[in-house]
Interface confidence: low
Amino acid sequence: PEPPTACREKQYLINSQCCSLCQPGQKLVSDCTEFTETECLPCGESEFLDTWNRETHCHQHKYCDPNLGLRVQQKGTSETDTICTCEEGWHCTSEACESCVLHRSCSPGFGVKQIATGVSDTICEPCPVGFFSNVSSAFEKCHPWTSCETKDLVVQQAGTNKTDVVCGPQDRLRA
């Protein structure tokens, strides 16, 4: 018969014959022959291969370098890479999470719309009318102005996006 020019899924063509690929988590030791099947070996500890493959070396698990503020979010297996994330207070600089930067703080007049995670930075929003923030913070939302009326007081000084209103006693009419 004619030698094949294409092979089935999970096979590869070598020396005019179709050999089985190694399954995820295993690497190629030797190609198949007319008489023998493909020889595969499991990846070692701290190594992985995540596809059907003919690789002769497994990939090293990603190293979550603590010197860069990284820690392991999900430990790698023989079929999956390690997933890194950042220590508390920091977030990844890229999707690959190869290093970390400090979470941004929201300035006075701005509040936290969304608290940062290990992979995304703080999202800030301007405090709308009726709300204020007087601190630079990565956690604080805009606070509503104090309601003087509910305390039976009146507004003595109007609030801004950075300051609360100042309440004071109502002027009593003298008899």
Partner: antibody
Framework: QVQLVQSGPGLVKPSETLSLTCTVS????????WSWIRQPPGKGLEWIGH???????NYNPSLKSRVTISEDTSKKQFSLKLDSVTAADTAVYYC?????????????WGQGTLVTVSS | EIVMTQSPATLSLSPGERATLSCRAS??????LAWYQQKPGQAPRLLIY???NRAADIPARFSGSGSGTDFTLTISSLEPEDFAVYYC?????????FGQGTKVEIK
């Protein structure tokens, strides 16, 4: 410029605990990682372990069971404790620091402390 | 752990000569390699990081090259103050490990 000044005894008895302290000046103790490295007389360098800005520690597996590294941010200090010492622990001990995220190595070094283990 | 092997152990050269120091890793460390200089009675000093980047205040006569498992530190023209011991260090895998050092001595 960050400077590291080491303090601690130069002589420790076998089976006792070696304790050294490193004081940071000229910069914040935060957002750096701080390591201890040792060098036996006439030999090469061996990394002992480190503590990161968040307080998380990592130790060399060969010493892990005997080592504790801690920090006191209020005093801008970090410390090394090595338990159950033997003559093989005789070495110059260095504290060293690096910037988190700088992806470099050990940027700053203490002056070194020769610790002799002997009765 | 990754074993770092430096060669030669000793290099005997004269001032003005070119020094070539070698460092080999037992497995790939990408470009995550640093070089340090240590003089007698002093702490090591960072010379090169990420295999080829000079640290602050390091003269241009020092250069690093290599990637994977083979690295070189070159001192283009030795000055009297360059005679010292040089160490390579990888930070690609845990734990960080150092080579045993190359002593550059005056011939």
């Amino acid at each position: 410029q960050v400077q590291l000044v080491q303090s601690g005894p130069g002589l420790v008895k076998p089976s006792e605990t070696l304790s050294l302290t490193c004081t940071v000046s000229g910069g914040s103790i935060s957002y750096y990682y701080w390591s201890w490295i040792r060098q036996p007389p006439g030999k090469g360098l061996e990394w002992i372990g480190h503590i990161s800005y968040s307080g998380s520690t990592n130790y060399n597996p060969s010493l892990k069971s005997r080592v504790t590294i801690s920090e006191d941010t209020s005093k801008k200090q970090f410390s090394l404790k090595l338990d159950s010492v033997t003559a093989a622990d005789t070495a110059v001990y260095y504290c060293a620091g690096g910037i988190v995220g700088a992806r470099r190595g050990f940027d700053f070094w203490g002056q070194g402390t020769l610790v002799t283990v002997s009765s | 752990e990754i074993v770092m092997t430096q060669s030669p152990a000793t290099l005997s050269l004269s001032p003005g000569e070119r020094a070539t120091l070698s460092c080999r890793a037992s497995q790939s460390v990408s470009n995550n390699l640093a070089w340090y200089q240590q003089k007698p009675g002093q702490a090591p000093r960072l010379l090169i990081y990420d295999a080829s980047n000079r640290a602050a205040d390091i003269p241009a006569r020092f250069s690093g090259s290599g990637s994977g498992t083979d690295f070189t530190l070159t001192i283009s023209s030795l000055e009297p103050e360059d005679f010292a011991v040089y160490y390579c260090q990888q930070r690609n895998n845990w734990p960080p490990t150092f080579g045993q050092g190359t002593k550059v001595e005056i011939k």
